[in-house]
């Protein structure tokens, strides 16, 4: 009911009403990432499943080429979880000359790209030092918040190291957004 | 206003309108867990407070026997946090014969049960290796995402080890869902 | 369309309809914290950016003096992430007299203040032991859930140690709420 003043003419309408069921929404789930080249000093973007299993896009929210495309301006709740896993970290090694090591780390960034704006905007970042000794490790980073987006904006999820992402299960690593 | 075409007859209606205040919603909070038998290789489900303190259910969203019962089909945002606490983990012990240890871990799963479907569906999983040395430890796992659910679906929260769940405060461990 | 019975008179109306775009909403982002006195045994509250960059308040949701002021009763989704960072923790030191150390920890609490009620209510808590050896550390705590709030309620974010909060980027530490 987007854009309709949905009332008898004698009533004052402050904003168009619309049914909740027709709002743009998406929940994307992890797939195996194909190793690809990415620009130096730029975190690689994940690609996603958008229609199988738990994944879906609806009401003009489309997924293409690692991006969720925002079809309508408004306030969106955006969320992602990335589960990382890796081998024993070396961050507990003896420090030389009294200097603390730069720790190993894992980072997730939800990024907005606006074609009319030269630089991507980082909306959300979760970053964690990893200092695990004695065994392989695994852990999730979860992010979620509300942002005002414009029609045509594109959203992606970037990670510090694509080779550490746990791509094995759709419930471990995911990305979604919905219009409020 | 569910199911009503809520407009003068000359207007095109794409989907029924409904007031936000009558949508199914619940926020459940932790209670002390009674040790119970559970199937081997199946994580035990938590039970919850549904009406005291911060907890509530409303608009036909009911809680019974560890399950949230979905009263109406639609897209729901589902979330949970479980705070775990435990003693020092042994995962950093010297490895024998060059074999990496299987690390201690904590896991939360939000699971959907559909009576017409034989197997539960894991919607969300947060899993983390625990390798803490020298002291007791505590940490939360948070999950949240949007899913398309059907009337009659049931939701529960399963954990890897019920004895590690911090049940002391309603703000530390909780579970909720609301229709978008 | 708050407060209007928005239908031809022959239809039963269960609750007033309202346009989604006029609901109270806020997303606040981190700023450098001014060291301030706070009561003993009470975690200090963070203050926030409310209009620059990604931050905004709208539809009568106001920010003042570390508080988000709730302008309308209803069910709100409330969320926050705080990224902490610090130096090597000492929690893995040898324990004296066989007693396990009280570990270093980081805690975030989202608190509700109701003027008519003497004590603040802790809505959400994320708390984590920190036991990092050999390097500096950093990590986020994320919280989010739905609560029934009353007009005039005030929300704030408290942390265990304001000096450990990473205030460097608006995507790392944030606080928000929106009426459902």
């Amino acid at each position: 009911l987007k854009g309709q003043e949905f009332a008898p003419s004698h009533q004052q309408v402050y904003a168009p009403l619309r049914a909740d069921g027709d709002k743009p929404r998406a929940h994307l789930t992890v797939v195996r990432q194909t190793p690809t080249q990415h620009f130096k000093n730029q975190f690689p973007a994940l690609h996603w499943e958008h229609e199988l299993g738990l994944a879906f896009t609806k009401n003009r929210m489309n997924y293409t080429n690692k991006f969720l495309l925002i079809p309508e301006s408004g306030d969106y709740f955006i969320y992602s979880q990335v589960t990382f896993r890796g081998m024993t970290s070396e961050c507990s090694e003896i420090r030389q000359a009294g200097r603390p090591n730069k720790p190993d780390s894992i980072t997730v960034v939800i990024t907005k790209v606006t074609d009319s704006y030269p630089e991507p905007t980082q909306l959300l970042m979760g970053t964690k030092s990893v200092c695990e000794v004695g065994s392989n490790w695994f852990q999730p980073i979860y992010l979620g918040a509300m942002f005002s987006l414009q029609e045509g904006d594109k959203l992606m999820v970037n990670v510090s190291d694509i080779s550490l992402v746990d791509y094995t299960k759709e419930d471990k690593t995911f990305f979604g957004a919905f219009l409020l | 206003l569910k199911g009503q075409e809520f407009a003068p007859s000359h207007q095109q209606v794409y989907a029924p309108l409904r007031a936000d205040g009558d949508k199914p919603r619940a926020h459940l909070t932790v209670v002390r867990q009674t040790p119970t038998q559970h199937f081997k290789n199946q994580f035990p489900a938590l039970h919850w407070e549904h009406e005291l303190g911060l907890a509530f259910t409303k608009n036909r969203m009911n809680y019974t026997n560890k399950f949230l019962l979905i009263p109406e089909s639609g897209d729901y945002f589902i979330y949970s946090q479980v705070t775990f606490r435990g003693m020092t983990s042994e995962c950093s012990e010297i490895r024998q014969a060059g074999r990496p240890n299987k690390p201690d871990s904590i896991t939360v799963v939000i699971t959907k049960v559909t009576d017409s479907y034989p197997e539960p569906t894991q919607l969300l999983m947060g899993t983390k290796s625990v390798c803490e040395v020298g002291s007791n430890w505590f940490q939360p796992i948070y999950l949240g995402a949007m899913f398309s659910l059907q009337e009659g679906d049931k939701l529960m929260v399963n954990v890897s080890d019920i004895s590690l769940v911090d049940y002391t405060k309603e703000d530390k461990t909780f579970f909720g869902a609301f229709l978008l | 369309l708050k407060g209007q019975e928005f239908a031809p008179s022959h239809q039963q109306v269960y609750a007033p309809l309202r346009a989604d775009g006029d609901k109270p909403r806020a997303h606040l982002t981190v700023v450098r914290q001014t060291p301030t006195q706070h009561f003993k045994n009470q975690f200090p509250a963070l203050h926030w950016e409310h209009e620059l960059g990604l931050a905004f308040t709208k539809n009568r949701m106001n920010y003042t003096n570390k508080f988000l002021l709730i302008p309308e009763s209803g069910d709100y989704f409330i969320y926050s992430q705080v990224t902490f960072r610090g130096m090597t923790s000492e929690c893995s030191e040898i324990r004296q007299a066989g007693r396990p150390n009280k570990p270093d920890s980081i805690t975030v609490v989202i608190t509700k203040v109701t003027d008519s009620y003497p004590e603040p209510t802790q809505l959400l808590m994320g708390t984590k032991s920190v036991c990092e050896v050999g390097s500096n550390w950093f990590q986020p705590i994320y919280l989010g859930a739905m609560f029934s709030l009353q007009e005039g309620d005030k929300l704030m974010v408290n942390v265990s140690d304001i000096s450990l909060v990473d205030y460097t980027k608006e995507d790392k530490t944030f606080f928000g709420a929106f009426l459902l």
Partner: antibody, heavy 117, light 107 residues
Framework: ELQLQESGPGLVKPSETLSLTCAVS????????WAWIRQPPGKGLEWIGE???????SYNPSLKSRVTVSIDTSKNQFSLKLSSVTAADTAVYFC???????????WGQGTLVTVSS | DIQLTQSPGTLSLSPGERATLSCRAS??????LAWYQQKPGQAPRLLIY???KRATGIPDRFSGSGSGTDFTLTISRLEPEDFAVYYC?????????FGQGTKVEIK
């Protein structure tokens, strides 16, 4: 402890199909991709392809037209089929666990397959 | 495909000496490079991933460095069990490819 064990015929005739199986024990089968890698005598390593528990596969483009990797989760094993073999396919064939992603931390001991009439 | 060229082909050293092995990629692979050790009649063993991260259980005399196109595996002090063939492997682009190997032999 994780163990991988290759099995299959050691001799295959030219133009026929090479078939190998890798049995996995000691670890959850569902949490990883599982790969086949080969090594011709006295030469380097070549990645053939991989599969996960859902049957999702990826293959080396140089072999893709001849390779099929399949999986049997009920038996915790995965298999390799390489069709239309020639002498150039003579190699030690290894199965391996893909971890961390795209590297291989656990390997079978390898099985030599000779293509000869 | 990305080609990996290892040098030297053979390295003759004595126990206790330092070994420096090189791997050059035909195009940038960022830090997506691993090193393996293989002894005769055995499967390869993962030593290093992410160009510089030691795999679980690998002694700290093994270290990796480099980024982009040029990478080095260093064995700080050769032990008798370190004499073997070493392979690099890139995973920046599909298909995954290996170098031709460097043999470290006893002088």
């Amino acid at each position: 402890e994780l163990q991988l064990q290759e099995s299959g015929p050691g001799l295959v005739k030219p133009s026929e199909t090479l078939s190998l199986t890798c049995a996995v024990s000691g670890l959850s089968f569902t949490d990883f991709y599982w790969a086949w890698i080969r090594q011709p005598p006295g030469k380097g390593l070549e990645w053939i392809g991989e599969i996960n528990h859902k049957g999702n596969t990826s293959y080396n483009p140089s072999l893709k037209s001849r390779v099929t990797v399949s999986i049997d989760t009920s038996k915790n094993q995965f298999s390799l089929k390489l069709s239309s073999v020639t002498a150039a396919d003579t190699a030690v064939y290894f199965c391996a666990r893909d971890f961390p992603n795209y590297t291989f931390d656990f390997w079978g001991q390898g099985t030599l397959v000779t293509v000869s009439s | 495909d990305i080609q990996l060229t290892q040098s030297p082909g053979t390295l003759s050293l004595s126990p206790g000496e330092r070994a420096t092995l090189s791997c050059r990629a035909s195009q940038s692979v960022s830090n997506h490079l691993a090193w393996y050790q293989q002894k005769p009649g055995q499967a390869p063993r993962l030593l290093i991933y992410g160009a510089s991260k030691r795999a679980t259980g690998i002694p700290d005399r093994f270290s990796g460095s480099g980024s982009g196109t040029d990478f080095t595996l260093t064995i700080s002090r050769l032990e008798p069990e370190d004499f073997a063939v070493y392979y690099c492997q890139q995973y920046a682009d599909a298909p995954l490819t290996f170098g031709q190997g460097t043999k470290v032999e006893i002088k």
